[in-house]
């Protein structure tokens, strides 16, 4: 008798998920000497252990602790770039500005970036058909809990001046329901973080509005100030300039030193 399978509203696990995670791990540890000690098979086993045989709506941060432990990584705490709704540009930026780091520039973020995964209760199978959607099904799903966990840890590690890149083309430039707004903002440590500096990226090249006056930015400023962290906001008007150096990373003026 064929076993009944739960149909979720979200897309299923990314095809070749185990192979992709393992391959990414190997590639990352080859490129980053400080992570060469990492055993990628153990990383995959810990990743798998976090969600396999578990109900995909009952995942906890605790489930990911073995993976967190294996993926422990020290990034310069004063060189952290957070982002919200503008991932590609943030990644272009850190590809050039090599001394700054997004979450996806760390091992754990790199492993999971753009991937979906989930299992099934009481079976060792990976569900490639469907996975829970955060809104329509449940928030405690494997993907959401993973990102909440790593995002919290990343924010907790930050110090000095922390930058966040925000999308000035969106109706809500700062969205308190985003991972940045719901997790990272609340886990910056006031005793370590002096300032949060927001970079509001303008879309149109003729745009000369001051988006730092946007009501959602004022809301962000209020949240941050209440946490005893200074807030700064800058309008960034020429995002096409980021590509200057992506195309020519060898250009000496594309480093942090000018």
């Amino acid at each position: 008798v064929p076993r009944w399978r739960q149909q979720w509203s979200g897309p299923g696990t990314t095809k070749r998920f185990p192979e992709t995670v393992l391959a990414r791990c190997v590639k990352y540890t080859e490129i980053h000497p400080e992570m060469r000690h990492v055993d990628c098979q153990s990383v995959w086993d810990a990743f798998k252990g976090a969600f396999i045989s578990k109900h995909p709506c009952n995942i906890t941060e605790e489930d990911y602790q073995p993976l967190m432990k294996l993926g422990t990584q020290t990034v310069p705490c004063n060189k952290i770039l957070l982002w919200s709704r503008i991932k590609d540009l943030a990644h272009q930026f850190t590809q050039v500005q090599r001394d700054m780091f997004t979450l996806e520039d760390t091992l754990l973020g790199y492993l999971a970036d753009d991937l979906t995964w989930c299992g099934e209760f009481n079976t060792s199978k990976i569900n490639y058909q469907s996975c829970p959607d955060w809104r329509k099904d449940c928030s405690n799903n494997p993907v959401s809990v993973f990102w909440k966990t790593v995002s919290r840890r990343f924010a907790e590690a930050a110090c000095d001046v922390v930058h966040v890149m925000l999308n000035g083309s969106r109706s809500k430039i700062f969205d308190k329901n985003s991972t940045f707004g719901s997790v990272e903002v609340h886990n910056l440590q006031p005793e370590k973080v002096q300032t949060l500096e927001a970079w509001v990226i303008h879309g149109g090249r003729e745009d000369s509005r001051d988006l730092c006056q946007d009501p959602t930015i004022k809301e962000l400023e209020s949240i941050i100030s209440k946490r005893n962290i200074q807030f700064s906001c800058k309008n960034i008007y020429r995002p096409d300039k980021f590509l200057q150096c992506v195309k020519n990373p060898e250009d000496s003026s594309c480093t942090s030193e000018i």
Partner: antibody, heavy 120, light 107 residues
Framework: QVQLVESGGGLVQPGGSLRLSCAAS????????MNWVRQAPGKGLEWVSA????????SYADSVKGRFTISRDNSKNTLYLQMNSLRAEDTAVYYC?????????????WGQGTLVTVSS | DIELTQPPSVSVAPGQTARISCSGD??????VYWYQQKPGQAPVLVIY???KRPSGIPERFSGSNSGNTATLTISGTQAEDEADYYC??????????FGGGTKLTVL
Amino acid sequence: QVQLVESGGGLVQPGGSLRLSCAASGFTFSSYYMNWVRQAPGKGLEWVSAISMNGDYISYADSVKGRFTISRDNSKNTLYLQMNSLRAEDTAVYYCARDLPLVYTGFAYWGQGTLVTVSS
Amino acid sequence: DIELTQPPSVSVAPGQTARISCSGDNLRHYYVYWYQQKPGQAPVLVIYGDSKRPSGIPERFSGSNSGNTATLTISGTQAEDEADYYCQTYTGGASLVFGGGTKLTVL
């Protein structure tokens, strides 16, 4: 090292035309916004025009809009400023300046300038 | 368009601290740049992004930007610092503006 060398300045009558050139070397020219900035004798700096990496975006100060045209030839590593309908108030040293990278919009490098004198 | 206002002149004794201000509406929302220009020479970038110093610029040059005012500070001013100083910002589109300039005199 980065070098910017302007040429093409000189004496021209009001209503006349002049074409300035800026030869760039020491960096990947096609990767940067380029600008013209001018300075009238004894006065401050005034931004004139900017052009994006591949020339698809151009902007001008109101004072020169409709009279000046900025362009670039990335194969020749050269920036140009075509100046038409020149007026006495256009008399200035014209500098070619290279933009800063990434989130910054200021001028990392400047040429030595070329003097344009508009007089009858 | 934002307008940047600088004092026409600032005087300082050698070894003392010189402060040059640059004011404009909500200037804190924009990165500010400072240039030094000596007679007959092209301007030189001394501060970018409010407070960053390009390589080769002495540590005595520093910058800040809060509220409506950006400030260039030269601590332990030397005779060779005598020059004109210009602030600059960019507020999008065709709005790249310079302040009127400040003549720094080292007494």
